[in-house]
């Protein structure tokens, strides 16, 4: 059978039941629930997952049972909707469920909150956790199923399995370890920061399908995988980025039982045919199904064929150039970011997609014109500055941070940015800021070919960050614009704002710079995100303050704290040097 | 709609030459993408060698690699199959066929929607 060509089924919850098994068929509803219902407590949905398991296994005891024929879409919302505290936990998001299908899920979709106000999840004491893991290990892995979906409506679900599992292999392991915390917390650290970073990257693919439609997600997969496996021909990508489309359209849609067994179709077929799609897939197609499809989707490009020809002969020297764009567009734009990624590992893939997208207008304009070739003959012309651009960019950003390291280079990007958007809330500037600035320690390390994809791609899914949490709460116009005109020049965009002329500064409050003897508590992380909470505000406060200006308070900020850290009374300390070091910064500033 | 004709088969030693032809005609957009393939007597039919004719870039089976080049005459419509250092194993009668690129995979002769009628290429001393 063809990857997703199957028959019709009689009842698509029993097929999924039986193609997925009880255990991940659970975990994908209760991923599923949780992502739509986000402030619902874990045993609600529990009590729910429960009765739809009950209900899914009547199904495959007979297909013809009632109710088994009905979408999942009608099954899981019914279900959804009979959560008893809706209207009072939700507002008006209960009014999706006077709406049929299809029209009800996708008003759930519309209701999913990128930042829900939920509490911070706090790590317990090694030693309880591990009692809990032993007292039920099948709650524990299910309450972190629950805890992570919640927070990350749109986190890829199958994906989500794979870190449950390592999640699971990590207390199996370290729970009987000597030392319990030196085994159990790197690891999960490492969990937290790669389960944040996919959440990330997977908000950029939904957003990229629901704001910008399929066709640009597809042009970004053509893109994306050409690099990866520059050996395939292009119908095999073609395929891929089809498939491909499809998994991550039902996820990003809450289809999340047909993504997990659409995607584990398509890991088979990768490694069925990986003789004609890539030769560095021999080692994923070994392991497990979860470590398989995220091995796949990590496995480093491809070495390219040798002698690939040049592309000035078919796509500009030709004569035939427009004949064969007319034929069919899309297939001959296709075949233009099919070839041209495959030669360029070095590129980004956002920038592979502003060359294509250059070189189809140019096509456009040229074809109706009265000499065509003479017309387009250039066009290649007009790629230089494109790919200079980020060249150029990364090489100044990364000289930066060499110079001042991560936590100086993310306050730079904080003073820089706050100047563009100081509407934007300090929460969110800080969090995006320290997240941009994490592209140093990131990518600057890498040889100059893998810079600018590591680099500019990360940074898309950074500000794709930015655009959700601000499509929220829209406080300022040129972010918005940004973030909506062209998904490939969000980056140049933002580059390109220069200081906010018409921000009114924010009016002083000295209640923002008053800091507590709890500070001295917190870990090094916490303590810079206040320093640089405190930065952001007294940019918003004097935005025209000078570079150096800023760094002398920060200065004696810093020591102010490293001072009263260290003091016998530290709350005194707080109180009495605080109001010193305001009265100073003002006058530093001029405020 | 397209017609295709190949030429150029024959008798040939083990570790001779050989250079088959395909002309095309009809509506050459939907012969963008060309290859060959070839089927010895009691086998099924297996991919050689694929070309676009947009962006020129080449797939080759694994057993020929090294050994055959594929390439094109986009003026005269015509593609090529350089055969060297043959072997016996390379009997066959060898078939173009053409079709478009987005569909076109070496593997699956069936993603294939044109064909000619074949050249008969037999090594043996």
């Known amino acids: 059978r063809g990857v997703f060509r199957r028959d019709a089924h009689k009842s698509e919850v029993a097929h999924r039941f039986k193609d997925l098994g009880e255990e991940n068929f659970k975990a994908l509803v209760l991923i599923a629930f949780a992502q739509y219902l986000q402030q619902c407590p874990f045993e609600d949905h529990v009590k729910l997952v429960n009765e739809v398991t009950e209900f899914a296994k009547t199904c495959v005891a007979d297909e013809s049972a009632e109710n088994c024929d009905k979408s999942l879409h009608t099954l899981f919302g019914d279900k959804l909707c009979t959560v008893a505290t809706l209207r009072e936990t939700y507002g008006e998001m209960a009014d999706c469920c006077a709406k049929q299908e299809p029209e009800r899920n996708e008003c759930f979709l519309q209701h999913k909150d990128d930042n829900p106000n939920l509490p911070r999840l706090v790590r317990p004491e090694v030693d309880v956790m591990c009692t809990a893991f032993h007292d039920n290990e099948e709650t524990f892995l299910k309450k972190y199923l629950y805890e992570i979906a919640r927070r990350h409506p749109y986190f890829y679900a199958p994906e989500l399995l794979f870190f449950a599992k390592r999640y699971k292999a990590a207390f199996t392991e370290c729970c009987q370890a000597a030392d319990k915390a030196a085994c159990l917390l790197p690891k999960l650290d490492e969990l937290r920061d790669e389960g944040k970073a996919s959440s990330a990257k997977q908000r950029l693919k939904c957003a990229s399908l629901q704001k910008f439609g399929e066709r640009a997600f597809k042009a970004w997969a053509v893109a994306r995988l050409s690099q990866r496996f520059p050996k395939a021909e292009f119908a095999e990508v073609s395929k891929l980025v089809t498939d491909l489309t499809k998994v991550h359209t039902e996820c990003c849609h809450g289809d999340l039982l047909e993504c997990a067994d659409d995607r584990a179709d398509l890991a088979k077929y990768i490694c069925e045919n990986q003789d004609s799609i890539s030769s560095k897939l021999k080692e994923c197609c070994e392991k497990p199904l979860l470590e398989k499809s995220h091995c796949i989707a990590e496995v480093e490009n491809d070495e390219m064929p040798a002698d690939l020809p040049s592309l000035a002969a078919d796509f500009v020297e030709s004569k035939d150039v427009c004949k064969n764009y007319a034929e069919a567009k899309d297939v001959f734009l296709g075949m233009f970011l099919y070839e041209y990624a495959r030669r360029h590992p070095d590129y980004s893939v956002v920038l592979l997609l502003r060359l294509a997208k250059t070189y189809e207008t140019t096509l456009e304009k040229c074809c109706a014109a009265a000499d065509p070739h003479e017309c387009y003959a250039k066009v290649f012309d007009e790629f230089k500055p494109l790919v200079e651009e980020p060249q150029n960019l990364i090489k100044q950003n990364c000289e930066l941070f060499e110079q001042l390291g991560e936590y100086k280079f993310q306050n730079a990007l904080l003073v820089r940015y706050t100047k563009k958007v100081p509407q934007v809330s300090t929460p969110t500037l800080v969090e995006v800021s320290r997240n941009l600035g994490k592209v140093g320690s990131k990518c600057c390390k890498h040889p100059e070919a893998k810079r600018m994809p590591c680099a500019e791609d990360y940074l898309s899914v950074v500000l794709n960050q930015l655009c959700v949490l601000h499509e929220k709460t829209p406080v300022s116009d040129r972010v918005t614009k940004c973030c909506t005109e062209s998904l490939v020049n969000r980056r140049p965009c933002f580059s390109a704002l220069e200081v906010d002329e018409t921000y009114v500064p924010k009016e002083f409050n000295a209640e923002t710079f008053t800091f507590h003897a709890d500070i001295c508590t917190l870990s090094e992380k916490e303590r810079q995100i206040k320093k640089q909470t405190a930065l952001v505000e007294l940019v918003k406060h004097k935005p025209k303050a000078t570079k150096e200006q800023l760094k002398a308070v920060m200065d004696d900020f810093a020591a102010f704290v490293e001072k009263c850290c260290k003091a016998d009374d530290k709350e005194t300390c707080f109180a009495e040097e605080g109001k010193k070091l305001v009265a100073a910064s003002q006058a530093a500033l001029g405020l | 709609e397209v017609q295709l004709l190949e030429s150029g088969g024959g008798l040939v030693q083990p570790g001779g030459s050989l250079r088959v032809s395909c002309a095309a005609s009809g509506n050459t957009y939907l012969t963008s993408c060309m290859g060959w393939f070839r089927q010895a007597p009691g086998k099924e039919r297996e991919g050689v060698s694929s070309i676009y004719t947009v962006g020129g870039s080449t797939f080759y089976t694994n057993s020929v690699k090294g050994r055959f080049t594929i390439s094109r005459d986009n003026s005269k419509n015509t593609l090529y199959l350089q055969m060297n250092s043959l072997r016996a194993e390379d009997t066959a009668v060898y078939y173009c066929?053409?079709?478009?690129?987005?569909?076109?995979?070496?593997?699956?002769?069936?993603?294939?929607?044109?064909w000619g009628q074949g050249t008969l290429v037999t090594v043996s001393s």
């Open positions: 066929a053409a079709g478009s690129p987005a569909r076109c995979r070496l593997r699956d002769p069936t993603t294939f929607d044109y």
